[in-house]
Interface confidence: medium
């Protein structure tokens, strides 16, 4: 239904607190360099304006679109060109081109320092003094570093942050209470960020149809008792919601997400038996709970999928009559039977089925031609199963850090042209798959591993797109989203790469490494490892092990020395010489 004032409508639906949070996220995601104080001033102005429109929908400018109102606010910022360069050119455009222009200038890797968590005491003091401002800073800092973060979900994490601080800041040992809890929130939020970026990439590159196929598969796995048309309705709504958030329509996105949660809770009988616990929660928690809901039990009496999709004499007729619907039903029926498959795999199988029908329905004897299609799925299913098996075995043998290093070597060999920080970040994230997925029950491993890897590889693609340096990476990133992971897995050592010159300064370390937190120490070592591989792409596992072992001992020894600086200065060149020799 149309509303006289879109902004008044959203303000009333969302309530002031969520409205302000979403406006802050929107501004922080568009203008990533602006300080919090500047954004919060704009948020207050927009909120005050929204209130005037709630009081009188006919008031001046209340009929303007939210993009127009937000864009006008952003373009009125003084010194916009000084701080943002060509992004200021967007302001010369009219809506909707202006918003499109803002979206194109979102930076996935902004030049911002890593978000440092303050000391527990300091954190509690500022939280207790002004919780609203404290949580506002959290929204701002996360949103500017993750310009595609799913806004209603970020509000949920801010709520979690609030809960943790409220609980822990009354404890005597605040740090002991805060650290593990905030680490858990951070870990979940970082995974959410890469997953949502993948969804926006899917939407941007391949459109709504591709995203809807993803949603149909996912919903069918979760709600195997829901009928196809119900799944279609849910997938259509989820597609619309994600399109809005990816497109910067955060108020509409959050409002529609709350509506979908309401619909699901009102229609539990036709969706899933598992929803009730979620439906008793307040709105943000309800939506999050529904998004993470466990799979419903598969109906016991499902007939073989072959009946409708292989044995039926009318397969080609049904397909020709309504291709998308027929393929959608195939994806639905296959997915609801296989919660143990990744969505990527299910989409590959649907693609294979589609290609088979395209080919066979044009031939003389279609049933004979497509009769073996389900058997032809076998290699497509075996490939990711083997990937999971070998990688989880390696993870169990090496542990997380060792597994990350193995992945780092592998990926540096595949794409040595990619910048070392990007390779290290990707390998560290890819390596976490072990901790995240390999400990799960067998039936949950494959979907966990492959869908997580796909999201991490999407991040690699997004960063590489900004400064393309490797033809192989470009090739894998340009293809279909569901083929990306198999494409990367199939890459071998890049034979075209000319090894990097050995630079002693790359492997020169100082005593400052000793005071770094463990994570930063690991990153330093992994940076050195990637550089070694770039210098010697064909170095054997044993050679690399020797050099890295030597390096670890050197750091350990010098950090324990009385005169650390002297130790690093004298032992460092010896290490470099030994390393060169070991790799010769």
């Amino acid at each position: 239904e149309a509303h006289k004032s879109e902004i008044a409508h959203r303000f009333k639906d969302l309530g002031e607190q969520h409205f302000k949070g979403l406006v802050l996220i929107a501004f922080s995601q568009y203008l990533q360099k602006c300080p919090y104080e500047e954004h919060i001033k704009l948020v207050q102005e927009v909120t005050d304006f929204a209130k005037t429109c709630v009081a009188d929908e006919n008031a001046e400018n209340c009929d303007k679109s939210i993009h127009t109102l937000f864009g006008d606010k952003l373009c009125a910022i003084p010194k916009l060109r000084d701080n943002y360069g060509e992004l200021a050119d967007c302001c010369a455009k009219q809506e909707p081109e202006r918003n499109e222009c803002f979206l194109q200038h979102k930076d996935d890797n902004p030049n911002l320092p890593p978000f440092q968590r303050p000391e527990a005491e300091a954190m509690c003091t500022s939280f207790q003094e002004n919780p609203t401002s404290f949580l506002g800073h959290y929204l701002h800092e996360v949103a500017r570093r993750h310009p595609y973060f799913y806004a209603p979900e970020l509000l949920y994490y801010a709520e979690k942050y609030n809960e943790v601080l409220t609980q822990c800041c009354t404890e005597s040992d605040k740090a002991a209470c805060l650290t593990p809890k905030l680490d858990a929130v951070k870990e979940k939020a970082l995974v959410a960020a890469v997953r949502q970026r993948m969804k926006c990439s899917s939407m941007q590159r391949f459109g709504e149809r591709a995203f809807k196929a993803w949603a149909v598969a996912r919903m069918s796995q979760r709600f195997p008792n829901a009928e196809f048309a119900e799944i279609t309705k849910l997938a259509t709504d989820v597609t619309k919601i994600n399109k809005e958030c990816c497109h910067g329509d955060l108020l509409e996105c959050a409002d529609d997400r709350a509506e979908l949660a309401k619909y699901m809770c009102e229609n539990q009988a036709t969706i899933s038996s598992k929803l009730q616990a979620c439906c008793d929660k307040p709105v943000l928690q309800k939506s999050q709970c529904l998004a993470e809901i466990e799979h419903d039990n598969i109906p016991a009496d499902l007939p073989s999928i072959a009946a409708d999709f292989v044995e039926d004499k009318e397969v080609c007729k049904n397909y020709a009559e309504a291709k998308d619907v027929f393929l959608g039903t195939f994806l639905y029926e296959y997915s609801r039977r296989h919660p143990d498959y990744s969505v990527s795999l299910l989409l590959r199988l649907a693609k294979k089925y589609e290609a088979t029908l395209e080919k066979c329905c044009a031939e003389g004897d279609p049933p004979a031609c497509y009769g073996t299609v389900l058997a032809e799925f076998q290699p497509l299913v075996e490939e990711p199963k083997n990937l999971v098996k070998t990688n989880c075995e390696l993870y169990e043998k090496l542990g997380e850090y060792g597994f990350q290093n193995a992945v780092l070597v592998r990926y540096t060999q595949k794409a040595p042209q990619v910048s070392t920080p990007t390779l290290v970040e990707a390998a560290r994230n890819l390596g976490r798959v072990g901790t995240k997925c390999c400990t799960l029950p067998e039936a949950q491993r494959l979907p966990c591993v492959e869908d997580y890897l796909s999201a991490i590889l999407n991040r690699l693609c997004v960063l590489h797109e900004k400064t393309p340096v490797s033809e192989k990476v470009t090739k894998c990133c340009s293809g279909s989203l569901v083929e990306r992971r198999p494409c990367f897995s199939a890459l071998t050592v890049d034979e075209t790469y000319v090894p990097k010159e050995f630079k002693a300064e790359t492997f020169t370390f100082h005593s400052d490494i000793c005071t770094l937190p463990d994570k930063e120490k690991q990153i330093k070592k992994q940076t050195a490892l990637a550089e070694l591989v770039k210098h010697k792409p064909k170095a054997t596992e044993d050679q690399l092990k020797t050099v890295m072992g030597d390096f670890a001992q050197f750091v350990d020894k010098c950090c324990k020395a009385a005169d650390k600086d002297n130790c690093f200065a004298t032992e460092g060149p010896n290490l470099v010489a030994r390393s060169k020799e070991a790799l010769a």
């Epitope: 009928e227 119900e230 309705k233």
Partner: nanobody, 126 residues
Framework: QVQLVESGGGLVQAGGSLRLSCVAS????????MGWFRQAPGKEREFVAA?????????YYADSVKGRFTISRDNAKTTVYLQMNSLKPEDTALYYC??????????????????WGQGTQVTVSS
């Protein structure tokens, strides 16, 4: 959008049989669960039978027709059928065909996306 047209109604003796058909136009027939409802003069519309979106789909029946009526569908012909055997005078009603997202909601006579036909009259004389 789905348009539905019923046929096959008529006058029949108690104990006789009739086969109702409902043809759907629109390219998304396969996406919908299909069902039959009936309304006797002066009474509420009541659920008769429903079938999920596939030809061999799950079927649901009202207790009053179980074992006598059979619902089936032919997706190629975008048609749903209701085979009515051992008809009784109390089966006399206007029979409606319906399309909805869910066969389960149809049983509760509250289709979420209700598409209705105009109805076909069935009269069973004793």
């Amino acid at each position: 959008q789905v348009q539905l047209v019923e046929s096959g109604g008529g006058l029949v003796q108690a104990g006789g049989s009739l086969r109702l058909s409902c043809v759907a136009s629109g390219r998304t027939f396969i996406a919908y669960a299909m069902g039959w409802f009936r309304q006797a003069p002066g009474k509420e519309r009541e659920f008769v039978a429903a079938i999920t979106n596939f030809a061999g789909g799950t079927t649901y029946y009202a207790d009053s027709v179980k074992g006598r009526f059979t619902i089936s569908r032919d997706n190629a012909k975008t048609t749903v059928y209701l085979q009515m055997n051992s008809l009784k005078p109390e089966d006399t009603a206007l029979y409606y065909c319906a399309a909805d997202r869910s066969a389960q909601t149809m049983r509760q006579v509250r289709p979420v996306l209700p598409y209705w036909g105009q109805g076909t009259q069935v009269t069973v004389s004793s």
